[in-house]
Amino acid sequence: TVPPMVNVTRSEASEGNITVTCRASGFYPWNITLSWRQDGVSLSHDTQQWGDVLPDGNGTYQTWVATRICQGEEQRFTCYMEHSGNHSTHPVPS
């Protein structure tokens, strides 16, 4: 088992909103839970954009998930990751 590296980035969306993206890479096996939580509660599937789980060329895998949030509310959002029985939460950088 190889645990993922998780990286959270932000980019400007429309006025007053930002897109936050959570990327997991370098993990094995490919089964992973990666999702955005608002106040610790998972967002509905239709309010998140998902990337496929793809091989990254080193025998490991990568994927991503993104959502749009109100600027100034970054603290409420975390990326939740679960892989091979381990879990972690990752805040949005300010």
Epitope: S44, D46, H87, S88, T89
Partner: antibody
Framework: EIQLQQSGPELVKPGASVKVSCTAS????????IYWVKQSHGKSLEWIGY????????ISNQKFTGRATLTVDKSSSTAYLHLNSLTSEDSAVYYC???????????WGAGTTVTVSS | DILMTQTPLSLPVSLGDQASISCRSS???????????LEWYLQKPGQSPKLLIY???NRFSGVPDRFSGSGSGTDFTLKISRVEAEDLGVYYC?????????FGSGTKVEIK
């Protein structure tokens, strides 16, 4: 079985402080936030705030800022609500609660009654 | 703060009746990403509240299908198709789309 066990009733004097505990069992404590909710006698519910046990990060209702402090002890899977400078307005039942996958308060503690009286 | 206004405050019913509770928010509780965190709870005397409905219309595990939630934007409704004795108590709507999270003032469902 997922459970949230709260500490017993408290009778405190005005101006004093109180610490209410909420001990989680039946799940990985750091996986879910712990929320705190106030219910004054015969009244509606009021959200106080929440804490992420994994990071220790908190978000609170501004109404309680400076009066309510949320902490956790990961080693004992326990969350705490510390209320200071108590007045009669703080007499209430205080609940801790835990969210689930897509919902906010799926599991509740039984509540802790705090009575502020001289 | 978002004000959640519930009507009626009291709802006398006969067992087997349909019951309907309205909850209106003072502004839209649809979040930027489309998420709507609107939930319904039932509290019986001397007990902690219990979750019935989450994200507007999803029944929580173990909740009978006589309970249904609907609505969007600022107007939401909880319906009980045939009221049973165990459904009596105080119902609260709750929004968690915007901080501070707020509850409605409650609707007491009681026997007529």
């Amino acid at each position: 079985e997922i459970q949230l066990q709260q500490s017993g009733p408290e009778l405190v004097k005005p101006g004093a402080s109180v610490k209410v505990s909420c001990t989680a069992s039946g799940y990985a404590f750091t996986k879910y936030n712990i929320y705190w909710v106030k219910q004054s006698h015969g009244k509606s519910l009021e959200w106080i705030g929440y804490i992420d046990p994994y990071t220790g990060g908190t978000i609170s209702n501004q109404k309680f800022t400076g009066r309510a402090t949320l902490t956790v002890d990961k080693s004992s899977s326990t969350a705490y609500l510390h209320l200071n400078s108590l007045t009669s307005e703080d007499s209430a039942v205080y609940y801790c609660a835990r969210p689930g996958s897509y919902w906010y308060f799926g599991v509740w503690g039984a509540g802790t009654t705090v009575t502020v009286s001289s | 703060d978002i004000l959640m206004t519930q009507t009626p405050l009291s709802l006398p019913v006969s067992l087997g009746d349909q019951a309907s509770i309205s909850c209106r928010s003072s502004q839209s509780i649809v979040y930027t990403n489309g998420n709507t965190n609107l939930e319904w709870y039932l509290q019986k005397p001397g007990q902690s509240p219990k979750l019935l409905i989450y994200k507007v219309s999803n029944r929580f595990s173990g909740v009978p299908d006589r309970f249904s939630g609907s609505g969007s934007g600022t107007d939401f409704t909880l319906k009980i198709s045939r009221v049973e004795a165990e459904d009596l108590g105080v119902y609260y709507c709750f929004q968690a789309s915007y901080v501070p999270f707020t509850f409605g003032s409650g609707t007491k469902v009681e026997i007529k």
